[in-house]
């Protein structure tokens, strides 16, 4: 079938990092600078990604393979193959549209990306409080009430509002 | 390619306790929030709650907090979802979704979902 | 609790556009999700983060938020596009979805 197919269409003949040039007799052409063909039989050869602004090359584009972005310094990347960079924000903080904000009383985010989050309700799950929460950490759980020995203590957190009252996202 | 797998469809009585799980086949990096969403026949999504497979903490809906735990398996990359004191409108299908590397509450990958169905 | 409201169903011709509506109390100072789901299977995300797709979403979809209103356009509408849509916030501790609108392809 290969070998039938490629008496029919000369350009299933060509390589990755090539393209099949119809202007030259379906001859297979090395794509031009700053774009690839990362599959054989290719037609034409796709656009290198830039990597300009906020995103910086972590890979550069071959005949064969597209450039790779990341983001610079106080940024991450979010969707495909790093589509878009986001500003960071610290620990403690989450960003909504207006920016940066702290984290409400009773919420926390341990990273540099995402919401506030509530801290956990540990007698939710039949555990009690060992750790407190703060801004930038969730509270930790420990043993239900009943496993502590008689004596032993366990802290007890400020109970966090129902509703800590997000900043908008 | 991450696949979350759930386990199979289930029948109980009203007053009894359902535990569905959610397996995560393929390459699943830490700390990604697993929720559970539920959908009953011919009804919209309802979201029940989420854990942090990295640390245990846990969110739940108001409705269903008291009736509802999760839990995980980090060694068996397994998240758990119990659901006690059954009752018929119970009666839904089950999802395991996980949270998206932005942490902003997009659910990017769903399991197959569980039926679970109760009645007397 | 936060509310959001979507219509219960939206018809379009093939090759139209589509757009589905998710009404919520200034929910443009929110993020909001889209999910796809059609009949005996799990929702799929077409659109995060009011507008940004994930990979293997066709260009046809895109989103907008602003005021009170964000909405899930769908252009050159295909059959295969026949599904129930959904919205969805984070609202002070809760994952809030909108009742879904189900959208018919005439």
């Known amino acids: 079938f290969e070998r039938t197919r490629s008496l029919q269409d000369p350009c299933s003949n060509c390589p990755a990092g090539t393209f099949c040039d119809n202007n030259r007799n379906q001859i297979c052409s090395p794509c031009p600078p700053n774009s690839f063909s990362s599959a054989g039989g290719q037609r034409t050869c796709d656009i290198c990604r830039q990597c300009k602004g906020v995103f910086r090359t972590r890979k550069e584009c071959s005949s064969t393979s597209n450039a790779e972005c990341d983001c610079t310094p106080g940024f991450h990347c979010l969707g495909a193959g790093c589509s878009m960079c986001e500003q960071d924000c610290k620990q403690g903080q989450e960003l909504t549209k207006k920016g940066c904000k702290d984290c409400c009383f009773g919420t926390f985010n341990d990273q540099k990306r995402g919401i506030c989050r509530p801290w956990t309700n540990c007698s939710l799950d039949g555990k009690s409080v060992l750790v407190n929460g703060t801004k930038e950490r969730d509270v930790v759980c420990g043993p239900s009430p009943a496993d502590l020995s008689p004596g032993a203590s366990s802290v007890t957190p400020p109970a966090p509002a129902r509703e800590p009252g997000h900043s908008p996202q | 390619q991450m696949q979350l797998v759930q386990s199979g469809a289930e029948v109980k009585k009203p007053g009894a306790s359902v535990k569905v799980s959610c397996k995560a086949s393929?390459?699943?990096?830490?700390?990604?929030?697993m929720h559970w969403v539920r959908q009953a026949p011919g009804q919209g999504l309802e979201w029940m709650g989420w854990?942090?497979?990295?640390?245990?903490?846990?969110n739940y809906a108001q409705k269903f907090q008291g009736r509802v735990t999760i839990t995980r398996d980090t060694s068996a990359s397994t998240a758990y979802m119990e659901l006690s004191s059954l009752r018929s409108e119970d009666t839904a299908v089950y999802y395991c979704?996980?949270?998206?590397?932005?942490?902003?509450?997009?659910?990017?990958?769903w399991g197959q979902g569980t039926l679970v169905t109760v009645s007397s | 609790s936060y509310e959001l409201t979507q219509p219960p169903s939206v018809s379009v011709a093939p090759g139209k556009t589509a757009r589905i509506t998710c009404g919520g109390n200034n929910i443009g100072s929110k993020s909001v999700h889209w999910y796809q789901q059609k009949p005996g299977q799990a929702p799929v995300l077409v659109i995060y983060y009011d507008s940004d797709r994930p990979s293997g979403i066709p260009e046809r979809f895109s989103g907008s938020n602003s005021g009170n209103t964000a909405t899930l356009t769908i252009s050159r509408v295909e059959a295969g596009d026949e599904a129930d849509y959904y919205c969805?916030?984070?609202?002070?501790?809760?994952?809030?979805f909108g009742g879904g609108t189900q959208l018919t392809v005439l």
């Open positions: 969805q916030v984070w609202d002070s501790s809760s994952v809030v």
């Open positions: 393929g390459y699943m990096p830490d700390g990604y929030y």
């Open positions: 854990i942090n497979p990295r640390t245990g903490g846990t």
């Open positions: 979704a996980r949270e998206g590397a932005a942490f902003r509450l997009e659910l990017d990958a």
